[in-house]
């Protein structure tokens, strides 16, 4: 005879999934806006800073009362892997002036991967589908001047300050609804 | 200096609808959550929802889904709460307040707009 | 909902002294580090103020002899020497969840 069977798989709790990843997020997103403060200290920024390659905001006006688990984790997915990619090329490429940054924009780095296993995980957990493997992006062009790594700079942490709050939102918001 | 200014008190009839305004100035109005919150008298403060200014993305305490509405003018820094199908127990003061991204804590209030319901 | 219950509903005090203040949550608001509490003190005819953030944060402009503290379900906020201009109410109120709800509030009276 084979092996005897493994203890029953003990379906998760899903509010407690979703409870661990809101605390991370939670989390990333105090470390953001701590770090997008201390860029506006060093470098204020003159207005809104946009950078084409970021993805648009999830949250529109009706969407969050529409939200559905599955849909919130694959776009919160998506988009937190651009962002991702984007600290990355902002260490990279950002020029001398944002090496003020570090290590706070490496910390950040670590934890924005750490969130996107946490993701991951979730996902798996819960059994939802599993996105299909992200086609090669194409590689971001650098900044052209030192003063465009601080306006993408500007844009990067704002928008993953955004991005955060949705997901902390929308998480919380169908944590009620399991 | 931060401030939160709302529109004036408001006399309605039972079944009506209000609107309320809260203008922003002094900060960057996309860079925090605009809030709402009721305090009905003898009653303890109770959250109606907020909204991203940003994105003008509203989330509501399920008790006041379907009734109230909230919206923003990001170009006026003004933020709107409508509260429709008013009744008795919708008499109030209505504070709109500036919440911490992601952590609904209210660091700036508005000074409040009196709400009475009345036949 | 998270329930906040504090005590005392009224507490009556003269200046100088000190007032320690209680919030009990119906469960748990803190996680990994973070405490979800907020207190917010109300003078008559004014909107609320807050105090302090995260249970223990102190906002920017508040007096020193504020503090907050706690994590669980039990927390405190103390005045460490009342001055003439702390009687008021003081409610609680937590974000661990969605939605936020505050304390039925303290009461504090010059005694």
């Known amino acids: 005879p084979g092996p005897p069977p493994g203890p029953p798989r003990v379906s998760p709790d899903p509010r407690a999934e979703l409870d661990s990843t809101v605390l991370l997020t939670r989390s990333l997103l105090a470390d953001t806006r701590q770090l997008a403060a201390q860029l506006r200290d060093k470098f204020p920024a003159d207005g809104d800073h946009n950078l084409d390659s970021l993805p648009t905001l999830a949250m529109s006006a009706g969407a969050l009362g529409a939200l559905q688990l599955p849909g919130v984790l694959t776009r919160l997915r998506a988009d937190l892997l651009s962002y991702l990619r984007h600290v990355q090329w902002l260490r990279r490429a950002g020029g001398s002036s944002l090496k003020t940054l570090e290590p706070e924009l490496g910390t950040l780095q670590a934890r924005l991967d750490r969130l996107l296993r946490r993701l991951q995980l979730l996902m798996s957990r819960l059994a939802l589908p599993q996105p299909p493997p992200d086609p090669p992006a194409p590689p971001l062009a650098p900044p052209s001047s030192a003063w465009g790594g601080i306006r993408a700079a500007h844009a990067i942490l704002g928008g993953l300050h955004l991005t955060l709050d949705w997901a902390v939102r929308g998480l919380l918001l169908l944590k009620t609804r399991l | 200096e931060v401030q939160l200014v709302q529109s004036g008190a408001e006399v309605k009839k039972p079944g009506a609808s209000v609107k309320i305004s809260c203008k922003a100035s002094?900060?960057?109005?996309?860079?925090?959550?605009m809030d709402w919150v009721k305090q009905a008298p003898g009653q303890r403060l109770e959250w109606i929802g907020d909204?991203?200014?940003?994105?003008?993305?509203?989330i509501y305490n399920q008790k006041f889904t379907g009734r109230a509405t909230l919206t923003v003018d990001k170009s006026a820094s003004t933020a709107y709460m409508e509260l429709s199908s008013l009744r008795s127990e919708d008499t109030a003061v209505y504070y709109c307040?500036?919440?911490?991204?992601?952590?609904?804590?209210?660091?700036?209030w508005g000074q409040g707009t009196t709400v009475t319901v009345s036949s | 909902d998270i329930v906040l219950t504090q005590s005392p509903a009224s507490l009556a005090l003269s200046p100088g002294e000190r007032a320690t203040l209680s919030c009990r949550a119906s469960?748990?608001?803190?996680?990994?580090?973070?405490?979800?509490i907020h207190w917010y003190q109300q003078k008559p005819g004014q909107a609320p103020r807050l105090l302090i953030y995260?249970?223990?944060n102190l906002d920017s402009g508040v007096p020193a002899r504020f503090s907050g503290s706690g994590s669980g379900t039990d927390f405190t906020l103390t005045i460490s020497s009342l001055e003439e201009e702390d009687f008021a109410t003081y409610y609680c109120?937590?974000?661990?969840?969605?939605?936020?709800?505050f304390g039925q509030g303290t009461k504090l009276e010059i005694k």
């Open positions: 469960k748990s608001v803190s996680t990994s580090g973070y405490s979800y």
């Open positions: 002094g900060y960057t109005f996309t860079d925090y959550n």
């Open positions: 995260l249970a223990s």
């Open positions: 109120q937590h974000s661990r969840d969605l939605p936020p709800t």
């Open positions: 909204i991203n200014p940003h994105s003008g993305g509203p």
């Open positions: 307040a500036r919440g911490e991204l992601g952590h609904w804590y209210f660091d700036v």
